[in-house]
């Protein structure tokens, strides 16, 4: 802290300009009048001035507004911003999508802070919604972004935002999410054809439940192994060996490098040895011949 | 994590002008500032100058007239140009950044080394 | 000349206690500006060890520790180790120069 001491003679801020990074800390915060320093923040970010003096700037505002900045000034802060507390982000009220990516420009190249993550709560709670702009904004920013929310919150996402969703931005996702994401990836890209649609849909496939997985396969879709790899087991599970392979199409012979992973493993144990032979990879593992198979899930079911 | 890589000449004629590049890896060039900080043989550490995310930059008084440091956001680099070197600028020279909200350098260049010689 | 100052070197053996001071005047460490430490072994670059004053980054031993008092601040290492024998740097910002200043360096001696 900064003590308070009388601004030395001759010494008293008029505006806010370079020849402020040669005041001595204490003469910062006895010189420097905060009501000046709001109405010309857009001038603090054209000044050198060091982490430190920052500080001292952060403190002369929190003095002039002690339940939280207008937008007017958060719109300005620039790297002012990296000086805030959660605490004091929680106070804020940022509406302005533009305020918004001036704040994230700051925090770029570096990891999502605690106060970058207040922030976005801030301002998605304040729209009430994750909108297309907001999502398209703050992938941008974090490609892994999305998958930072829980299932709750991803439910939020009208599935009009899902068009600004890149492959990339799902990586991190765990199949809930996905299971969450997938059927708004399905309303927005339905009127797609099918080569299109696959291409937009293939990285929330994660989320995919059987009977749409048996649809593409009817649609010579080429599935890559990555995609297939990603699938829910009690969604593989169901397929035929028919319907693998026309969903893989070229990418079949991949199976043999998986066969001892997850979902290919427990989807090779519930075929026919014979049907798996047809596709002539060496498969093995599935049932042998004259076996007669229980689902007895499906027992259950009707009972 | 972010890493740098400083390079240039390692041997520059008196009266001539040292030309070194700083190479930010694995991160953004658009931090707050970066710094140019060097280390004569034996002795201690002096701070260069340093550049802004905007392109302001501000130099150690006793080097002003001779230092220049400029970035290039395309190619996650800055640059600084000393002119007129003599023996006296022998030193290793180091990149430096700042610790995210603090004027403490906690990510450095390995350093290059240049020696100023006819 | 250095801005700030060091004293050229200290030792100590294995397991004591060493100080090394940081000495600057009312347009730096007086000014109310921050200290910084930083570690330098033999052919490497300087590590960051302590910050704003006392703070410790993540991976530095608690064996570190700093303070700051009016112009001067100082560096304190508890249970000397062979490994901590290097060069230490101390520094600040210096309002009169607009710029960082740092220490001449202090070599610490771990005595075997």
């Known amino acids: 802290e900064v003590e308070k001491t009388a601004c030395p003679s001759g010494k008293k801020a008029r505006e806010i300009d370079e020849s402020l990074i040669f005041y001595k800390k204490w003469e910062l915060e006895a010189c420097v009048d905060a009501a000046l320093l709001a109405t010309q923040m857009d001038r603090v970010n054209a000044i050198p001035f060091t982490y430190e003096q920052l500080d001292v700037l952060k403190h002369k505002l929190d003095e002039l507004y002690p339940q939280g900045y207008p937008e007017s000034v958060i719109q300005h802060l620039g790297y002012l911003f990296l000086k805030m507390s959660p605490e004091d982000i929680r106070k804020w009220n940022v509406t302005s999508l533009e305020t918004l990516k001036a704040l994230l420009e700051v925090n770029k190249g570096h990891e999502m802070s605690p106060q970058v993550a207040t922030l976005i709560d801030r301002f998605v709670k304040g729209r009430g919604q994750l909108d297309k702009d907001t999502l398209d904004t703050l992938t941008a920013f974090y490609p892994g972004y999305l998958c930072s929310l829980s299932p709750e919150e991803l439910s939020s996402v009208p599935p009009s935002s899902i068009w600004a969703v890149r492959p990339q931005d799902l990586d991190t996702c765990d199949p809930r999410q996905l299971d969450v994401l997938y059927p708004k990836a399905r309303l927005a890209f339905q009127n797609m054809n099918g080569s299109e649609y696959f291409v937009k849909i293939q990285s929330f496939l994660g989320g995919a439940p059987t009977e749409d997985l048996k649809a593409l396969s009817q649609q010579n879709v080429s599935m890559d192994l990555a995609t297939f790899m990603k699938l829910r087991t009690d969604a593989v599970l169901p397929l035929t060996v028919a319907e693998v392979q026309k969903l893989l199409g070229p990418h079949v012979e991949g199976l043999k490098a998986e066969e001892r992973h997850r979902p290919v493993r427990d989807w090779i144990l519930r075929q026919r040895q014979d049907d798996l032979d047809t596709l002539g990879l060496g498969l093995q593992g599935g049932i042998p011949n004259g076996y007669l198979v229980l689902d007895l899930s499906m027992q259950e079911a009707l009972s | 994590q972010v890493q740098l890589q400083e390079s240039g000449p390692g041997l520059v004629k008196p009266s001539e002008t040292l030309s070194l590049t700083c190479t930010v890896s694995g991160g953004s060039i658009s931090s707050y500032y970066w710094n140019w900080i060097r280390q004569p043989p034996g002795k201690g550490l002096e701070w260069i100058g340093r550049?802004?995310?905007?392109?302001?930059?501000y130099y150690n008084p006793s080097l002003k007239s001779r230092v220049t440091i400029s970035g290039d956001t395309s190619k996650n680099q800055f640059s600084l140009k000393l002119s007129s070197v003599t023996a006296a600028d022998t030193a290793v020279y180091y990149c430096?950044?700042?610790?995210?909200?603090?004027?403490?350098?906690?990510?450095w260049g390995q350093g290059t080394m240049v020696t100023v010689s006819s | 000349q250095s801005v700030l100052t060091q004293p050229p070197s200290v030792s100590g053996a294995p397991g004591q206690r060493v100080t090394i001071s940081c000495t600057g005047s009312?347009?730096?460490?007086?000014?109310?500006?921050?200290v910084h430490w930083y570690q330098q072994l033999p052919g490497t670059a300087p590590k960051l060890l302590i910050y704003g004053n006392s703070n410790r980054p993540s991976g530095v031993p608690d064996r570190f520790s700093g303070s700051k008092s009016g112009t001067s601040a100082s560096l304190a290492i508890t249970g000397l180790q062979a490994e901590d024998e290097a060069d230490y740097y101390c520094?600040?910002?210096?309002?009169?120069?607009?710029?960082?200043?740092f220490g001449g360096g202090t070599k610490l001696t771990v005595l075997s």
């Open positions: 520094q600040s910002y210096d309002s009169s120069l607009s710029g960082w200043v």
């Open positions: 430096a950044r700042p610790k995210l909200g603090i004027d403490a350098f906690d990510i």
């Open positions: 550049i802004y995310y905007n392109g302001n930059t």
């Open positions: 009312s347009s730096n460490i007086g000014a109310g500006y921050d």
